[in-house]
Interface confidence: low
């Protein structure tokens, strides 16, 4: 033979202060017939929290429509929750008797505890930019949870990553909580376009972990690689010499041309172009004018890159006396 | 000019872990400015991108794969690896290597031949 | 994953037609599209990347266009030789993802 149970499947229920908890019962059987009533605590001194015939529940409404006979859901919702609302609740279901109902059965209990959400994570990053194969440190913080047990996750470009140091304080009882985390990432030459994740997962959030990010736009620097090239062709008395850097970053770039040692003040062509991995390249183009006294020209190309030390490339012109004594415009 | 060749058993287990390797001759995987990839081809189908390693180790993987998927990279021997466990005759593909520049012509502008690995008993 | 739709899924045409086949992505990938030559046994070749540029050593009759969601990828005059199947791949995202491709065939 079939026997009633009283289902109620959430052991421990976490609520925020002022919001509404939904304590669920079900019930597997509508015999024998009788009301099911909602209690907190258990004994002689349990406290009666709704009763559908008799009573004013204020802040109790029920989930499904009780009046209906075939109803099994005896689920309710307390508003407005409070410190004092903590507790452990039972449906009970009551056997119709005369002169007055017999307690038939309990269902095992819904612990409601207070809980708190953390806050948006924070993730901040190092202070000063460092270069790709360098490791960096990222840190994370979430504040006012409750309770204290929480899950917090890295992640780099959507990979989980295992480099970190995650604390929870305090360390005994507490109102709330904080979470403190540190990981430690390697960088990429294209990590001007990554992102550090920091993902922080706790049973108030019911399942949609709050997440902080850093670019490691912020800390990276990609240092440029320079090539100084005399172009074959010459236009009249004039080489032109070019100065490429490449896959720099952040943009922030000075460049200088040199002639034997003097630097030039003349205005140079340039363009700046963008690399798919945020990189940028800068092209820089200096006119020579050729002259038979102008036989050991030595051009330097000096590029300072966001505040570091200057770095320099050196070409010795190759100037022919073929080329010397060409007259038209453009001679290879 | 950089070339790649795949090479690993062409004939797998069910259940078993496919391995394959790609040797990269008149280039260095260390020297940078690319990454390794894995694209699979099933037969008569399209491309499947699998996952990518940098000569650093730093990898990324497809999402669909990626709780099977391994990418490996040994400089010294100028090789990189895929690894993909618990195969199913699925998994029966032409699995292609390539490098992946990171500026410049971003595509898989080095392709291996491709190697056929069916899986069956 | 970003969704490339390629059309039509096959095709045929005479040598010296204009072949046009067509991209499109599920969400903006800007320019961040290759196309791809596949032959019968081979591995794929890069014939266009960044959308609309011609890798070294590719004829010129091949072209690319296009931006954001939508990428046209041309033969301006058919020839034998082009007889292949054509991706398009995106890399703005990772994953990279491949279109279902285009068979193209001389009639």
């Known amino acids: 033979e079939e026997e009633l149970q009283m289902i109620q499947p959430e052991k421990l229920l976490l609520v925020t202060v002022g919001k509404t908890a939904t304590l669920h019962c079900t019930v597997t059987s509508l015999l024998p017939v009788g009301p099911v009533l909602w209690f907190r605590g258990v004994g002689p001194g349990r406290e009666l929290i709704y009763n559908q015939k008799e009573g004013h529940f204020p802040r109790v409404t029920t989930v499904s429509d009780l009046t209906k006979r075939n109803n099994m859901d005896f689920s309710i919702r307390i508003s407005s929750i409070t410190p004092a609302d903590v507790g452990t609740y039972y449906c009970v279901k009551f056997r119709k008797g005369s002169p007055e109902n017999v307690e038939f059965k309990s269902g095992p209990g819904t612990e409601m505890a207070l809980g708190a959400k953390p806050s948006a994570p924070v993730v901040l990053g190092p202070a000063a930019r460092t270069t790709p194969e360098h490791t960096v440190s990222f840190t994370c913080e979430s504040h006012g949870f409750s309770p204290r047990d929480i899950t917090l996750k890295w992640f780099k470009n959507g990979n989980e990553l295992s480099d970190f140091q995650t604390n929870v304080d305090p360390t005994g009882q507490s109102v709330a909580y904080s979470i403190r985390s540190t990981a430690r990432v390697v960088l990429d030459p294209w990590d001007v376009r990554s992102q550090v994740i920091c993902e922080v997962a706790h049973v108030t959030l019911q399942g949609d972990p709050l997440r902080g990010t850093a670019n490691l736009s912020e800390a990276i620097r990609v240092p440029p690689t320079l090539e100084v090239t005399q172009q074959p062709m010459r236009v009249g008395n004039q080489v032109n010499v070019t100065c490429q850097v490449r896959k720099f970053y952040p943009q922030s770039l000075q460049l200088t041309w040199s002639e034997n040692g003097n630097v030039c003040q003349r205005e140079t062509a340039s363009t700046l172009t963008e690399n798919k991995d945020g990189t940028y390249n800068w092209t820089s183009w200096f006119l020579v004018n050729i002259s038979d006294q102008r036989d050991d020209v030595v051009l330097t190309c000096q590029v300072k890159h966001d505040g570091q030390l200057a770095v320099s490339k050196r070409l010795a012109l190759e100037v022919t006396v073929h080329q010397k004594d060409q007259s038209s415009d453009a001679t290879p | 000019q950089v070339q790649l060749q795949e090479s690993g058993p062409g004939l797998v287990k069910p259940s078993q872990t496919l391995s394959l390797t790609c040797t990269v001759s008149?280039?260095?995987?260390?020297?940078?400015?690319?990454?390794w990839s894995w694209i699979r081809q099933h037969p008569g189908k399209g491309l499947e991108w699998i996952g990518y390693?940098?000569?650093?180790?730093?990898?990324y993987y497809n999402p669909s794969l990626k709780s099977r998927v391994t990418i490996s990279v040994d400089t010294s021997k100028n090789q990189f690896s895929l690894k993909l466990s618990s195969v199913t005759a699925a998994d029966t593909a032409v699995y292609y290597c390539a490098r992946e520049g990171l500026d410049g012509s971003y595509g898989s502008s080095a392709w291996g031949q491709g190697t056929l690995v069916t899986v069956s008993s | 994953d970003i969704q490339l739709t390629q059309s039509p899924s096959s095709l045929s045409a005479s040598v010296g037609d204009r072949v046009t086949i067509t991209c499109q992505a599920s969400?903006?990938?800007?320019?961040?599209l290759n196309w791809y030559q596949q032959k019968p046994g081979k591995a794929p070749k890069l014939l266009i990347y960044d959308a609309s540029n011609l890798e070294t050593g590719v004829p010129s009759r091949f072209s690319g266009s296009g931006s954001g969601t939508d990428f046209t990828f041309t033969i301006s005059s058919l020839q034998p030789e082009d007889i292949a199947t054509y991706y398009c791949q995106q890399f703005a995202y990772l994953p990279y993802t491949f279109g279902g491709g285009t068979k193209v065939e001389i009639k």
């Open positions: 008149g280039g260095s995987i260390s020297s940078g400015g690319y990454y």
């Open positions: 390693i940098y000569y650093s180790g730093s990898t």
């Open positions: 969400q903006d990938i800007s320019n961040y």
